[in-house]
């Protein structure tokens, strides 16, 4: 009679994470008598996966009834597969011996490969806000996928970005992989409503890529522009001066009025109006009693936006001239206007 052969018909098996893997194995003869064992790996360090004789193997079931005398099918199923289960599995026949069974013949091995989905991409931006025209970096990370091949793309408002660097880790063979990408984005004043999207495509996703997003509203700071204007006279000796604070983001803003360098009033932006691009406008006014001043008055609107150094705009109010209804665009009233940083 021909000597027993152990047949593992599948050279490789590909299984999705969470599914059940079937590893096929048959013997060509009932002789010699003895159990079979399944191992992962070869050599002394091989790991025991299933022992027909004894042991507790909660994830393993046999395809056929191994207790039947004429059984020659030693296939097994391994449930709830994870990437850590990848490897080469050997079906090994033992000959009954005393005191121990003796290894008789091994199958050629079946390589189990596991397909695992990438985790949802997580996009993170810079720790501190940046202003328009500056370049900021965004990172995207996704983990736990297998096989290694993966595609990552970056978009800003639907437009694909090209300035990014991507690494898939580790370089060598592994049970599962991670991807890390860094994209550079140039901010514009219109980016309050913009989104940066990281898109990951993998064979396990069946053409439906995963996306991670970051809102540029978390990243951008649009500094305000200031305009100080003198409004028409309300009463004989009162002048209304307004400070228009335009196109700023985020909303956090504090405004201080100074009369000849002395603090007159401080207020926090509350009832702002929102522009289409997501930036805000706000207006503050100051009623100046001209009769209380003998000399010309320098009015300064000083704005501290989002914890940044203050910016200011000044306006010279002439008290020598008789107050009359006029705007701020007359030469006399605008001569002292300037913009400076207060530190």
């Amino acid at each position: 009679e021909e000597e027993l052969q152990v047949i593992q018909p599948d050279k490789s098996v590909l299984v999705a994470a969470g599914e059940t893997a079937t590893l096929r194995c048959t013997a060509t003869s009932l002789i010699p008598v003895g159990p079979i064992q399944w191992f992962r790996g070869a050599g002394p360090g091989r790991e025991l996966i299933y022992n027909q004789k004894e042991g507790h193997f909660p994830r393993v079931t046999t395809v056929s009834d191994l207790t039947k005398r004429n059984n020659m099918d030693f296939s097994i199923r391994i449930g709830n597969i994870t990437p850590a289960d990848a490897g080469t599995y050997y079906c090994v026949k033992f000959r009954k011996g005393s005191p121990d069974d003796v290894e008789f013949k091994s199958g050629a091995g079946t390589e189990l490969s596991v397909r695992a989905k990438p985790s949802a991409p997580v996009v993170s931006g810079p720790a501190a806000r940046a202003t328009p025209q500056h370049t900021v970096s965004f990172t995207c990370e996704s983990h736990g996928f297998s096989p290694r091949d993966i595609t990552l793309k970056w978009f800003k408002n639907g437009n694909e970005l090209s300035d990014f660097q991507t690494n898939v880790d580790p370089v060598g063979e592994s049970v599962s992989y991670s991807i890390h990408s860094t994209a550079k984005v140039v901010l514009t004043r219109e980016d309050v409503h913009s989104q940066v999207i990281c898109e990951v495509a993998h064979v396990t996703l069946q053409g439906d890529p995963l996306r991670g997003t970051a809102n540029l509203s978390e990243t951008i700071r649009v500094p305000p522009t200031l305009e100080v204007t003198q409004q028409p006279v309300r009463a004989e000796n009162q002048v209304n001066v307004t400070c228009q604070v335009r196109k700023f983001y985020p909303q956090r803003l504090q405004l201080t009025w100074l009369e000849n360098g002395n603090v007159s009033r401080t207020e926090t932006a509350s009832t702002v109006t929102e522009n289409k691009d997501g930036t805000y406008n706000w207006m503050s006014w100051l009623l100046v009693n001209v009769s209380a001043h003998r000399d010309d008055v320098k009015l300064t609107c000083q704005v501290e936006h989002d914890g940044q150094p203050a910016v200011s705009k000044s306006h010279d109010l002439k008290v020598s001239a008789h107050p009359k209804e006029q705007g701020s665009n007359t030469a006399a009233e605008n001569t002292g206007s300037n913009e400076r940083n207060i530190y």
Partner: antibody, heavy 117, light 108 residues
């Protein structure tokens, strides 16, 4: 959590015997090969012996015929019987779990064996 | 028996710098080479196996590479906890599982 705890080390004279134990927990002991590795004071690592899941034993030439590795699966314990000890056997003895890739992924803290007259 | 030769014996590096050291096998081991880290008074810790596969929980700053029988371990940016002795080990399918003599990475 995988844990390996060695015991049985101590001071012996040349020619004497010692039996080291390694108690394993946190993994299915019966499913993995286990090994002994030693480190002489101020020296590098030296593989000593390994026992496979089926009980097959392997030894370094330097200990062959003097040391015996064994396992008690019911107690999840690995042993190393050391006979005919020599001064050059003085070392910290580590036990380690062996992966199917034949690398040692978890190690005990070691037990010191000193052979001196 | 496969002999593994590590070089240099000692490497002096400043924190934040890149550290690279090698292990040469006396005969072919394929990609079956592992790296371990050992700190004073501690047991060794598996870092890398199969020449370039990081073990579970090992940071990405550790990477391995192979060129024939020459293997390299690189630590991209040394952290204070990385100052230790590093050993290579061949893990072909059959014993003896030999180790290299070790490379000590010390603070410059």
């Amino acid at each position: 959590d995988v844990q390996l705890v060695e015991s049985g080390g101590g001071l012996v004279r040349p020619g004497e015997s010692l039996r080291l134990s390694c108690a394993a927990s946190g993994f299915t002991f019966t499913n993995y090969a286990v090994t002994w590795v030693r480190q002489a004071p101020g020296e590098g690592l030296e593989w000593v012996s390994l026992i496979s899941v089926t009980g097959t034993t392997y030894y370094a030439d330097s200990v062959k015929g003097r040391f015996t590795i064994s396992r008690d699966n019911s107690k999840s314990t690995l042993y190393l019987q050391m006979n005919g000890l020599r001064a050059e056997d003085t070392a910290v003895y580590y036990c380690a779990k062996v992966t199917w890739k034949n690398v040692f992924d978890y190690w005990g803290l070691g037990t010191l064996v000193t052979v001196s007259s | 028996e496969i002999v593994l030769t590590q070089s240099p014996g000692t490497l002096s590096v400043s924190p934040g710098e890149r550290a690279t050291f090698s292990c040469r096998a006396s005969q072919t081991v394929g990609s079956k080479l592992a790296w371990y880290q050992q700190k004073p008074g501690q047991a060794p810790r598996l870092l890398i196996y199969d020449a370039n596969t990081r073990a579970t929980g090992i940071p990405a700053r550790f990477s391995g590479s192979r060129s024939g029988t020459e293997f390299t371990l690189t630590i991209s940016s040394l952290q204070s906890e990385d100052f230790a002795v590093y050993y290579c080990q061949q893990h072909t399918d059959w014993p003896p599982y030999t180790f290299g003599g070790g490379t000590k990475v010390e603070i410059k």
